[in-house]
């Protein structure tokens, strides 16, 4: 039950995260005009990954797309790439995780297959979240660098008399949406990976009881039946090793005071 809840919650958190990454990528407010300590302008500039916009105090808003590909800064291209990779991985992860959900029955899909799919989607969500966080952080770093550069020469004097105000840009809403969304996707991915551990039917090489005896001895189940190695071979005169951790179904295989003859 806990596994199903963890998986379901991981799916929902990742879904919200990926929706947020998509929203952030499409948003125009990645960088917004810094209004602090600036002359009050009747024009507000803001920029996204795909276009830049100007909102006038009259209410008129005009947005222009970046129609050039080669003319754009390499950093912007890198951020675009990271966000798109994040979205693509996240979308594939969502698709995979839908089929991996324990509450959804698809044919005769085994738990091991669901576990693998859960792990795959979890890893995809983690990478998707990291891509988004990296993309947003790269853009934020670019803004900080440009901000201090433009602050250094906030007013560039022209002929001593005329002044040109340099527009400074600060963090836009999309950055915060991106950080939160990336974090949620990452958390969702981790939850899916945790759920995968609980889903996996933990296979053992030998389902017999391990014990050490001085003479010829045989391991018996309480019903008097000879314990099996899992391969149908005789256990007489052999040291039998447990192949690892057991599932709940194997509990009766543990030695008890009745197991020795």
């Amino acid at each position: 039950m806990a596994v199903t809840a963890c998986q379901g919650l991981g799916f929902v958190v990742s879904l919200i995260g990926i929706a947020g990454i998509i929203a952030a990528t499409c948003m125009d407010q990645w960088s917004t005009q810094d209004l602090y300590n600036n002359p009050v302008t009747a024009v507000f500039n803001y920029q996204g990954l795909w276009r830049s916009c100007v909102r006038e105090s009259s209410g008129f808003t005009e947005c222009r797309g970046y129609f050039t590909l080669l003319g754009l800064p390499a950093m912007l291209q890198a951020v675009r790439a990271l966000m798109i990779v994040g979205i693509v991985l996240g979308a594939i992860g969502l698709l995979v995780s839908i089929f991996a959900l324990k509450c959804i029955r698809i044919g005769s899909m085994e738990d091991s297959a669901k576990a693998n799919m859960t792990l795959t989607s979890g890893i995809m969500f983690i990478v998707s979240g990291l891509c988004a966080i990296a993309g947003v952080s790269v853009f934020a770093n670019m803004l900080v660098t440009n901000f201090w550069m433009s602050t250094a020469n906030m007013y560039t004097g022209m002929g001593g008399m005329v002044q040109t105000v340099q527009t400074r840009y600060t963090f836009g809403a999309a950055l915060f949406v991106g950080w939160v969304a990336g974090g949620l996707t990452l958390i969702g991915g981790v939850m899916m990976c945790i759920a995968c551990r609980g889903l996996a039917p933990e296979e053992t090489n030998y389902k017999a009881v391990s014990y050490h005896a001085s003479g010829h001895s045989v391991a018996y189940k309480p019903g008097g039946f000879k314990a099996s190695t899992g391969f149908g071979s005789n256990t007489k005169n052999k040291k039998i090793y447990d192949g690892g951790a057991r599932t709940e179904d194997e509990v009766q295989s543990y030695p008890s005071k009745h197991d020795y003859v």
Epitope: V43, E56, S57, V165
Partner: antibody
């Protein structure tokens, strides 16, 4: 057709108060930034106040800040200018204008005269 | 505050002549975001309120005759009337629409001989 009709202009004593109104029609009033501009007897144009869409922000020049208040009633399609502590230099023709693209004033009313006597 | 300086303060021309008037701002009115200059030109005929002629320094308002042309960028702007008509008798004002407070030039009075 866009129409802006100002009213409320009068002769007032220095230090007095006055409220100007501007009735708007022919456009969606609530979707536009509105302004008051005055023209002095020397024919100089002076921007007095601007209220943006929604009325959340208002802007004034230092010469009237704290004395004049621009407001709007979108339900009545009316723009107001509350003037207090009037001075002789406030004597002017007051125009109400609709702000459009480029923050320019595309539509102006016919104006109302405010005279402040010493 | 931004100071808008217009020159000449008045000019007298004959009908059909080409007229240019200048407007200078104390700070650049060019917005880097959209590469537009927030300067507006108005025409005020006697006994009338001002009428919008040109916005964004060079965009003609609809209904304005194409003999009116705005040009310039940054701090220096010009209004040109290619062939003056008798009905162009008016005072022409330029305005800063970029910085608050919005400021107007003192005007250029155009008179016809």
């Amino acid at each position: 057709e866009v129409q802006l009709v100002e009213s409320g202009g009068a002769l007032v004593k220095s230090g007095g108060s006055l409220r100007l109104s501007c009735a708007a029609s022919g456009f969606t009033f609530s979707n536009n930034a509105m302004s008051w501009i005055r023209q002095t007897p020397e024919k100089r144009l002076e921007w007095v106040a601007t209220i943006i869409i929604g009325g959340t922000y208002t802007y004034y020049p230092d010469s009237v800040k704290g004395r004049f208040t621009i407001s709007r009633d979108n339900a009545k399609n009316t723009l107001y200018l509350q003037m207090s502590s009037l001075r002789s230099e406030d004597t002017a023709f007051y125009y109400c204008a609709r702000q459009v693209y480029g923050n320019s004033f595309a539509y102006w009313g016919q104006g109302t005269l405010v005279s402040v006597s010493a | 505050d931004i100071v808008m300086t217009q020159s000449p303060s008045s000019l007298t021309v004959t009908a059909g002549e080409k007229v240019t008037m200048s407007c200078k701002s104390s700070q650049s009115l060019l917005n880097s975001g959209n590469q537009k200059n927030y300067l507006t030109w108005y025409q005020q005929k006697p006994g009338q309120p001002p009428k919008l002629l040109i916005y964004w320094a060079s965009t003609r308002e609809s209904g304005v005759p194409d003999r009116f042309t705005g040009s310039g960028s940054g701090t220096d702007f010009t209004l040109t009337i290619s062939s003056v008509q008798a009905e162009d008798l008016a005072v022409y004002y330029c305005q800063n629409n970029y910085f608050y407070p919005f400021t107007f030039g003192s005007g250029t009075k155009l008179e016809i001989k």
